[in-house]
């Protein structure tokens, strides 16, 4: 009753559908502002399916719409905190090939410790998508505060 | 012009689409941090098609990747009272079967009156979801303030 | 191996997967608190395909379950601003036909600046969706900033 | 088991201040919220304000909110109501009370405190 | 401020018959999927006990003899059976904001 069965045992490579969802592993040196993401089951819950992970940065395999989402968390966080140490932005975009290079989803924290959104946008095959945390907070590394992860939707 | 023609009339089932969007019923007694959750056509917007409710807890009927998303909204609630209380947070996890229990998805409130977030996970037939709420400020019930919803993506 | 090949060549349309993406364009005139959309490949990584635009609105051409999503961030907004202009909230609804009209969404901005959220909702052909902003401050119009989109998901 | 242990009676004059304690036992003080309320002699229920006990943030009935304080000590698991220049009419029971899960509505009351303002 | 208006102010009923108390605030009460307004038992020298709450959910221990319903800005109290230990005075409350305000009260006797 797979959908693949469904399919006449078409591989699901096939049919598109390539997912991926990140853990933080760790926040970039000094003039880095990137977060570098890390996927597998050996990991938990991650999971690359299609997508790739370059350098800790997410790397597109396929052409599409994809949904996009995020959620970070800072660690060790109050709205006072986050209210003195503002501002903390997030910003996810497509930052090589340097041609394509633009910010796709911007949230700042203000008094809170969360931001979480998402988005359809297209993606090509060789975007990489970087994730910018710009402020002096570091970011959780718990697997349900912190994730980020791209869905694909359609040609 | 529906899908199922598309695929030779086979049914929705066989292609694994499982789908629910769920409104709030009620909170748990003293002890117990759940909330309870109910769907069906005759309750407005809310709908389960493949996963089923068990005492208003989310119970998974096939194996994937699914979308999990949450919104909840604070009855009563202002910025004010909110910081006036307790830290109020929801998590969103796997609570049976026991030897899959894990949290998949957690948020506080800090000075804000609503959370919303989602995630990809991996999740199995039998898999039971709940939704824990500490704090002591009462969920809203409207349907467009408190809601929560699976989506299968793929196998 | 596009979805569309595997397939046997059927046309996306006949899949079902409607899709948009749409950026804001402009705010209504005074009594009028809706955001008015505008999506399309000229303008940047906005879309439509399926939903089409009714004079800034969404109008739904497919009947099915949907994925709606929206991320409003509010302009020169800090979390003082935003306390100080509360109430702030945003609504998302079928706004026609008059006998289908209802808030499917609905979120307040508090001390924050950007609010964003989804949720599935079974929408009809004709379905036209309404994104209501009551409060005095303007939404930013910076694309990766502020959304809002559908995704057809099942029947 | 939740309780809640108020200070004894007190007798004041007109224009004096009165302080009253309300020790919590049996739950996380600094969980719950703990509002007042007070009673005159054969008369209603009128509530006074609440804090809570985590930071201390008070909110006050506007009817006195210049003449109450609110103040809490984590070290003892005990709140105060503090309510200044005292007049007759001041004189009622004092009641501590709690929740059981959420704000609103009380399960749990202290025994009360008669404050008796007279010259 | 909300007011919250009791009646009767005093109410004798038989033994085993039913008592029924209202309540109307001055607006609603009823917001977010709740109505926010709750009963309390006092009998002489003690401190209030919580009945119900939420206009219509009954406290853990409550006999369920007491119920209680209604929304927006009218609500009732009921006792279906009166018994002798029921005797006391009965408030109602509101918590739909700040500052939470009781009604006057009404005195349950036996008849």
């Known amino acids: 009753q797979r959908f693949a069965q469904a399919q006449q045992q078409l591989p699901l490579e096939s049919l598109g559908w390539d997912v991926a969802e990140l853990q933080l592993n760790h926040t970039g040196p000094q003039q880095d502002p990137r977060l570098y993401w890390q996927g597998g089951p050996a990991l938990g819950r991650s999971f690359l399916h299609g997508p790739e992970l370059d350098k800790g940065q997410l790397r597109i395999h396929r052409d599409g719409i994809y949904m996009v989402h995020i959620q970070v968390t800072l660690a060790i966080c109050s709205s006072t905190t986050a209210s003195r140490h503002h501002p903390t932005t997030l910003a996810v975009g497509i930052c090589s090939p340097a041609s394509r290079s633009i910010s796709l989803l911007r949230l700042s924290f203000h008094q809170g410790c969360t931001i979480a959104s998402q988005r359809l946008t297209p993606l090509a095959r060789g975007d990489t998508l970087c994730t910018n945390l710009t402020g002096t907070l570091l970011p959780s590394r718990n697997t349900d505060e912190t994730f980020f992860g791209v869905q694909w939707v359609r040609p | 012009q529906r899908f199922a023609q598309a695929q030779q009339q086979l049914p929705l089932e066989s292609l694994g689409w499982d789908v629910a969007e769920l409104q709030l019923n009620h909170t748990g007694p003293q002890q117990d941090p759940r909330l309870y959750w109910q769907g069906g056509p005759a309750l407005g917007r809310s709908f389960l098609h493949g996963p089923e409710l068990d005492k208003g807890q989310l119970r998974i009927h096939r194996d994937g990747i699914y979308m999990v998303h949450i919104q909840v909204t604070l009855a009563i609630c202002s910025s004010t009272t909110a910081s006036r209380h307790h830290p109020t947070t929801l998590a969103v996890g796997i609570c049976s079967p026991a030897s899959r229990s894990i949290s998949l998805l957690r948020l506080s409130f800090h000075q804000g009156c609503t959370i919303a977030s989602q995630r990809l996970t991996p999740l199995a037939r039998g898999d039971t979801l709940c939704t824990n709420l500490t704090g002591t400020l009462l969920p809203s019930r409207n349907t467009d303030e408190t809601f929560f919803g699976v989506q299968w993506v793929r196998p | 191996q596009r979805f569309a090949q595997a397939q046997q060549q059927l046309p996306l349309e006949s899949l079902g997967w409607d899709v948009a993406e749409l950026q804001l364009n402009h705010t209504g005139p005074q009594q009028d608190p809706r955001l008015y959309w505008q999506g399309g490949p000229a303008l940047g990584r906005s879309f439509l395909h399926g939903p089409e635009l009714d004079k800034g609105q969404l109008r739904i051409h497919r009947d099915g379950i949907y994925m709606v999503h929206i991320q409003v961030t509010l302009a020169i907004c800090s979390s003082t601003t935003a306390s100080r202009h509360h109430p702030t909230t945003l609504a998302v609804g079928i706004c026609s036909p008059a006998s289908r009209s209802i808030s499917l969404l609905r979120l307040s901005f508090h001390q924050g600046c950007t609010i964003a959220s989804q949720r599935l909702t079974p929408l009809a052909r004709g379905d036209t969706l309404c994104t209501n902003l009551t409060g005095t401050l303007l939404p930013s119009r910076n694309t990766d900033e502020t959304f809002f989109g559908v995704q057809w998901v099942r029947p | 088991e939740v309780q809640m242990v108020q200070s004894g009676a007190e007798v004041k004059k007109p224009g004096a201040s009165v302080k009253v304690s309300c020790k919590a036992s049996?739950?996380?003080?600094?969980?719950?919220?703990i509002h007042w309320v007070r009673q005159a002699p054969g008369q209603g229920l009128e509530w006074m304000g609440d804090?809570?006990?985590?930071?201390?943030?008070?909110s006050y009935n506007q009817k006195f909110r210049d003449r109450v304080t609110m103040t809490r000590d984590t070290s003892t698991s005990t709140v105060y109501m503090e309510l200044s220049s005292l007049r007759s009419e001041d004189t009622a029971v004092y009641y501590c009370?709690?929740?059981?899960?959420?704000?609103?509505?009380?399960?749990?009351w202290g025994q009360g405190t008669l404050v008796t303002v007279s010259s | 401020d909300i007011v919250m208006t009791q009646s009767p102010d005093s109410l004798a009923v038989s033994l085993g018959e039913r008592a029924t108390i209202n309540c109307r605030a001055s607006?609603?009460?009823?917001?977010?999927?709740?109505?926010?307004m709750h009963w309390y038992q006092q009998k002489p020298g003690q401190p209030p006990k919580l009945l119900i709450y939420l206009a219509s959910n009954l406290e853990s221990g409550v006999p369920d003899r007491f119920s209680g319903s209604g929304s927006g800005t009218d609500f009732t109290l009921t006792i279906s059976s009166l018994q002798a230990e029921d005797v006391a005075v009965y408030y109602c409350?509101?918590?739909?904001?700040?500052?939470?305000?009781f009604g006057g009260g009404t005195k349950v006797e036996i008849k």
């Open positions: 009370a709690t929740f059981s899960r959420f704000d609103g509505w009380f399960a749990y």
């Open positions: 607006r609603s009460v009823s917001t977010s999927g709740y109505s926010y």
């Open positions: 804090i809570y006990p985590g930071n201390g943030d008070a």
């Open positions: 049996g739950y996380t003080f600094t969980t719950y919220n």
């Open positions: 409350q509101h918590s739909r904001e700040l500052p939470y305000t």
